[in-house]
């Protein structure tokens, strides 16, 4: 049994880091493998993560963490029984993938303005809470070409757009994702999408 693709890990900078790797053949990850992880800190202990299958030869492990600070570094040991398959380290602050925003809502009752709001996925005491920026994706269910991205570079989790920038009388969907420049993070996963019917009063044409 050998590791074909070494573990790579990302942290949500809150309570979970996710490590993925591939074995050289079909593997029952949860029964055959264990990923031990330990914070490099005085009097810390090793903790065990039981991996799950992620495709035939792929494994994924969700490492529980108390919290994360930039100084943290973890040692990682991948074991198959008594055999050490791989040894490495992981610094969560250098591999951050933020949590996805939630509760995306489209408010259509604000005159002819669409107000999209969502929730910051972090509590106020988390460092990322005040460092997230967002991308909002809006697309038409009827027209695949009608697909747009709005970059929200301010901290408030909301976006206002004129309803007239979208076509009237058709349904749209929206989703949002987040990233943090301070840690050069990857983008989060997209939030679940929300749907609404776009309609607005066309202005009278003056002749």
């Amino acid at each position: 049994m050998k590791v074909l693709q070494e573990p790579t890990c990302v942290s949500d900078y809150m309570s979970i880091s996710t490590c993925e790797w591939k074995m050289n053949g079909p593997t029952n990850c949860s029964t055959e493998l264990r990923l031990l992880y330990q914070l490099v800190f005085l009097l810390s202990e090793a903790h065990t993560c039981i991996p799950e299958n992620n495709g035939g030869a792929g494994c994924v492990c969700h490492l529980l963490m108390d919290d994360v600070v930039s100084a943290d570094n973890y040692t990682l040991d991948l074991w198959a029984g008594q055999q050490l398959l791989w040894k490495g380290s992981f610094k969560p602050s250098e591999h951050v993938k933020p949590r996805a925003p939630g509760n995306l809502t489209v408010h259509t009752n604000v005159s002819d303005t669409l107000l999209l709001t969502w929730s910051n996925p972090y509590p106020p005491d988390n460092y990322l809470y005040n460092h997230l920026t967002y991308a909002v994706n809006i697309w038409s269910e009827n027209d695949p070409a009608d697909f747009r991205i709005y970059n929200v570079t301010y901290l408030e989790p909301s976006l206002r757009i004129a309803a007239s920038t979208l076509k009237s009388g058709i349904s749209y969907r929206a989703r949002v994702r987040a990233w943090a420049q301070c840690y050069n993070t990857t983008w989060s996963e997209w939030s679940p999408s929300t749907k609404w019917h776009n309609s607005y009063r066309e202005p009278f044409e003056q002749h």
Epitope: L43, S44, E45, A46, M65, D66, D67, A71, D72
Partner: antibody, heavy 125, light 112 residues
Framework: EVQLVESGGGLVQPGGSLRLSCAVS????????MSWVRQAPGKGLEWVSS????????YYADSVKGRFTISRDNSKNTVYLQMNSLRAEDTAVYYC??????????????????WGQGTTVTVSS | DIVMTQSPLSLPVTPGEPASISCRSS???????????LDWYLQKSGQSPQLLIY???NVAAGVPDRFSGSGSGTDFTLKISRVEAEDVGFYYC?????????FGQGTKLEIK
């Protein structure tokens, strides 16, 4: 009520051995790291050794490394310090102390908040 | 090793007056989680040491509120707002960020 009671001290010749014990009650022993600290006559405090709650992490002062062994028996709520090749400079009162919670991912520290009464080790010919 | 240096080594104080002890570490004892791994202990004559302050500023359970700790990084101070006769003994600072844990030389507080 938290209690730590050391025993096993005494008079021993240079090169001899002693095993100190520290019996603990009043808290969840296996969750906490434990430490030994000593104090030579008329001197200050000197850290000797520490062990994590599960026993997997062990640390020693350079002055005792290779001669002293710390261990614990969580079923007996007891931490031990096996002292071999004793020297005159090991003469001291030895205290055990309750250290940080070590079973969490990041050990949680509240100081060495409880100490035993100490046991005296005298190394002399 | 992190060297801890205390001053003064002797501190005669009049009861009711304030007292202050300084502790300096040769390297920072501040970890990235924002905590300073610096404690203060009092050892009264013939007794075991007792914890006064942990993580730089936190007063241990049962310790009178006349004791307080301050400082960060490498410079720390223990203050007693009004010294009482029962406060006599040796005061030690100790860092527990890295092994070996290291103590200051001790400050002897005595009543004038």
């Amino acid at each position: 009520e938290v209690q730590l009671v050391e025993s096993g001290g005494g008079l021993v010749q240079p090169g001899g051995s002693l095993r100190l014990s520290c019996a603990v009650s009043g808290f969840t022993f296996s969750s906490y790291a434990m430490s030994w600290v000593r104090q030579a006559p008329g001197k200050g405090l000197e850290w000797v050794s520490s062990i994590t709650g599960g026993g997997g992490g062990i640390y020693y002062a350079d002055s005792v490394k290779g001669r002293f062994t710390i261990s614990r028996d969580n079923s007996k709520n007891t931490v031990y310090l096996q002292m071999n090749s004793l020297r005159a400079e090991d003469t001291a009162v030895y205290y055990c102390a309750k250290d940080r919670i070590s079973i969490t991912i990041r050990p949680r520290y509240f100081g060495l908040d409880f100490w035993g009464q100490g046991t005296t080790v005298t190394v002399s010919s | 090793d992190i060297v801890m240096t205390q001053s003064p080594l002797s501190l005669p104080v009049t009861p009711g007056e304030p007292a202050s002890i300084s502790c300096r570490s040769s390297r920072s004892v501040l970890y990235g989680n924002g905590y300073n791994y610096l404690d203060w202990y009092l050892q009264k004559s013939g007794q075991s040491p007792q914890l006064l302050i942990y993580l730089g500023t936190n007063v241990a359970a049962g310790v009178p509120d006349r004791f307080s700790g301050s400082g960060s990084g490498t410079d720390f101070t223990l203050k007693i707002s009004r010294v009482e006769a029962e406060d006599v003994g040796f005061y030690y600072c100790m860092q527990s960020l890295r092994t070996p844990y290291t103590f200051g030389q001790g400050t002897k507080l005595e009543i004038k």
